[in-house]
């Protein structure tokens, strides 16, 4: 059996090498001699010779200064033989423990840690952490036991122990109150890390701490009165231009500027801030009226875009504006005029009378008449007194210049101010109809096949109005009916078929047809037919010669 | 019942006319147009022209145009074909038809053809 | 003016066979109407405006077509359809009837 005590060496011992470790010693030994080996890592394995064994006497030995923290274990296998090389014993594992020194200080992970607080933020605010490490043995002896500490703080204001460090974890934390970005923006600590609980080796690095901005400033109004003009009538005019500060950010929440109007419950105007330098600019929501109101006092009110993180109070302005008189428009009462009129309407009688106000009371102003659009020139206007009588006749029918029987008519007033003013008011004549269209066929040139023709439906089309318009009436006349007939094509007989009444040779006839309408306004209308060379439906043809009452004649 | 009469044959020598008849019956003869078609021994049919009965309108093929001449008369409900300077390739069955070119077609009646022999 | 041809110019059928005879037309047409011709008689009209049986014909012929190509179809040929068949446009001046074909029965 093997004889080993427990093996330990300390690191960095001195000379002189090599040194004693333990003797290691087999029991067979006093059955006869016994010669000792050792092998593995440190013997005869990298590295090579640092332990050797004095091989009669079992004295093992350590040949040079060990470093633990590159090897902190040795693992070695003891070995015994007799004099003529029998093992007497089986290999023995020995653990050769390298014992610790405090021969490594620690090292903080970074040179420059970097963390950020709000401004204003409470103590026991955590704002960052650093962290070191140390490569000594911190199982078995406090050689790696780093604690933390603040050597320096810049600025040292507004106290010179802002700051605070846990000794055990590098946590960071706000200690006094008083953290203000606009005052001090960014903080300075050189921090400290110390083996053996701080006692022992020690190094440095530096803590930079951004104070991040809140939102403890207001915007504050400078100059706080402010004088503008604007002609009346005129929206999204600039009146004038509304100046703060805010010490806060740049151009963060904090720092933008809303401005409020307290005072403006008609809507009357707007501020809108600049991007740029968060100016307030004052403009016209709607036009004013300068004959309701001709000064408006008006108080703003300057907060953020976010709110305020402390209570703080709102600056305010004042802003006297003064409207300006302009020459206005006559303004036509109602701006849009219907008056019904029946289409036979005497000439030269007066329809209507349509007038304007004249808007500037403060003025007195003539207003003259007269017509701006009158497309079929059916109306003339008395300059004087707006009086609106007939010129022509009036034609519901006239489709050019009637739309769903309405005539529009434009009538302009102007004024005698400086700059003359000119309104415009819209006459709708709606004209009721009367009988004076009779009914035409639609269309009017017709195509039949000379072999095996279709019918042609033909419709009736009368530019009146009900009951001025079907059912009609449809009849062949001047002797069309000898080779043509027609039937009505519908219930309310507004189409006809026309087809003839025998086969019929290629070329153009002439048939009268006759249609009245409901209330018995009749037109005898020609319709022009023409016979191709075809066989059944007939698209369009060449003409021939006409054909008096649907028969030809010879030429 | 609708009836195209023609005579069966008719013989006339090189150069010479004839003049080809169509007696009808049975339907009011200026209501409908009659057409004239020519069909040679063993060939198709050829069409040569028609006339309206009641106005004397007359329409022919351009390869005919020289050669036949249609005529009626009203009174007699016959229809005529003059054929002129005929050869041996006149020589061939016409035939009368009568057509409803107002309707679909569907009444078309034909005579029994008379053969035209030219021969010296 | 309008040529039709007719295709095939000669043909033979068996009893109950379907039989079809077309009819090309130079330019486009409107209807085409057929017409059967017997040796030694007048030509009937068959079919008029493209599809229209006329009075008398059987059922088993039937017509179709459009444009410039047109067709007679009898279902099941019989003995007594054998006959020549002739196509006729009348959709303009001059009145054109295809060459004929001849159908016999086998």
């Known amino acids: 059996d093997w004889v080993i005590p427990p093996i330990s060496c300390p690191e960095n011992e001195k000379g002189p090498f090599p040194k004693n470790l333990v003797q290691i010693k087999s029991n067979k030994d006093k059955e006869g001699k016994v010669f000792y080996s050792i092998t593995g890592q440190g013997a005869d394995t990298p590295p090579v010779g640092v332990f050797i064994i004095e091989r009669e006497t079992g004295w093992l030995k350590v040949t040079e200064p060990l470093d633990r923290e590159r090897i902190a274990t040795y693992t070695l296998f003891s070995h015994a033989v007799s004099s003529n090389g029998n093992a007497v014993e089986d290999p023995m594992e020995i653990l050769i423990t390298v014992t610790d020194q405090n021969d490594n200080k620690p090292e903080f992970t970074q040179e420059v840690f970097k963390g950020s607080v709000m401004e204003g933020a409470l103590p026991g605010t955590s704002v960052m952490e650093v962290t070191a490490t140390d490569a000594d043995d911190d199982v078995n002896t406090y050689n790696a036991a780093i604690a933390y500490t603040i050597l320096s703080q810049d600025p040292e204001l507004p106290d010179k122990n802002m700051f605070t460090i846990n000794r055990n974890t590098g946590v960071i934390s706000v200690v006094t109150t008083g953290l203000d970005r606009e005052s001090f923006p960014t903080y300075t600590l050189v921090v400290q890390a110390a083996d053996l609980q701080g006692e022992g080796l020690s190094t440095t690095a530096t803590a930079v701490i951004t104070v991040t901005d809140t939102n403890d400033n207001p915007p504050i109004f400078n100059p706080t009165t402010y004088k503008g003009q604007v002609p009346e009538n005129e929206a999204n005019v600039v009146i004038t231009t509304l100046k703060v500060t805010d010490a806060d950010a740049p151009n963060t929440p904090a720092w933008e500027a809303v401005y409020t109007i307290l005072n403006d419950d008609g809507g009357q105007f707007v501020v809108t801030t600049n991007p740029v330098n968060n100016d307030g600019i004052l403009k016209t929501a709607k036009g004013l009226d300068f004959e309701a109101k001709q000064q408006y006092i008006l108080h703003v009110a300057v907060t953020n875009v976010v709110p305020f993180e402390v209570s703080l109070t709102t600056s305010t302005a004042t802003v006297t504006v003064d409207v300006l008189d302009v020459n206005e428009a006559p303004i036509f009462v109602p701006p849009e005029k219907r008056v019904e009129v029946s289409e036979d309407f005497g000439v030269g009688q007066e329809i209507t009378s349509y007038t304007a106000q004249e808007p500037d009371t403060f003025m007195e102003q003539k207003i003259t008449y007269r017509i701006w659009r009158d497309t079929a020139n059916w109306l003339e206007i008395n300059p004087d007194t707006g009086a609106i009588s007939t010129r022509a006749e009036l034609d519901r029918e006239d489709f050019e210049h009637v739309k769903n029987s309405t005539y529009t008519a434009l009538i302009i007033a102007t004024d005698n101010g400086s700059p003359v003013a000119t309104g415009t008011g819209t006459l709708l004549l709606i004209l009721s109809d009367v009988n004076d269209n009779a009914p035409i066929p639609e269309p009017r040139t017709i195509f039949f096949c000379e072999r095996n023709p279709k019918p042609q439906v033909i419709n009736i089309i009368d530019a009146d109005l009900p009951p001025n318009t079907s059912p009609f009436t449809a009849e062949l006349t001047h002797g069309a009916s000898a080779n043509w007939t027609i039937q009505y094509n519908d219930p309310t007989q507004e189409s006809i078929i026309l087809k003839p009444k025998m086969a019929l040779e290629v070329g153009d006839y002439k048939i009268n047809l006759k249609l009245m309408d409901n209330q018995n306004k009749d037109q005898v209308t020609t319709l022009e037919v023409s016979v191709c060379d075809c066989e059944g439906a007939a698209g369009v043809c060449r003409k021939a010669q006409p054909v008096e009452a649907g028969l030809q004649i010879p030429a | 019942q609708v009836q195209l009469q023609q005579p069966g044959a008719e013989l006339v020598k090189p150069g010479a006319s004839v003049k080809l008849s169509c007696r009808t019956s049975g339907y009011s003869f200026t209501s409908y147009w009659i057409h004239w078609v020519k069909q040679r021994p063993g060939r198709g049919l050829e069409w040569i022209g028609r006339?309206?009965?009641?106005?004397?309108?007359?329409k022919y093929n351009e390869n005919f145009k020289n050669k036949a001449t249609l005529t009626v008369d009203k009174s007699s409900n016959t229809a005529y074909m003059q054929l002129s300077s005929l050869t041996s390739e006149d020589s061939a069955v016409y035939y009368c038809t009568r057509e409803d070119s107002y309707g679909p077609f569907d009444l078309d009646y034909w005579g029994q053809g008379t053969s035209v022999t030219v021969s010296s | 003016q309008i040529v039709l041809t007719q295709s095939p110019a000669i043909m033979s059928a068996s009893p109950g066979e379907k039989v079809t005879i077309t009819c090309s037309a130079s330019s486009s047409v409107s209807y085409m109407h057929w017409f059967q011709q017997k040796p030694g008689t007048s030509p009937k009209l068959w079919i008029y405006s493209t599809s229209n049986l006329a009075s008398g014909v059987p059922a088993r012929f039937s017509g179709s077509g459009s444009g410039t190509s047109y067709s007679l179809t009898i279902s099941r040929m019989e003995a007594e359809d054998a006959a020549t068949y002739y196509c006729q446009q009348r959709s303009t001046y001059p009145y054109t009837f295809g060459g004929g074909t001849k159908l016999e029965i086998k």
């Open positions: 006339i309206v009965p009641n106005s004397g309108g007359t």
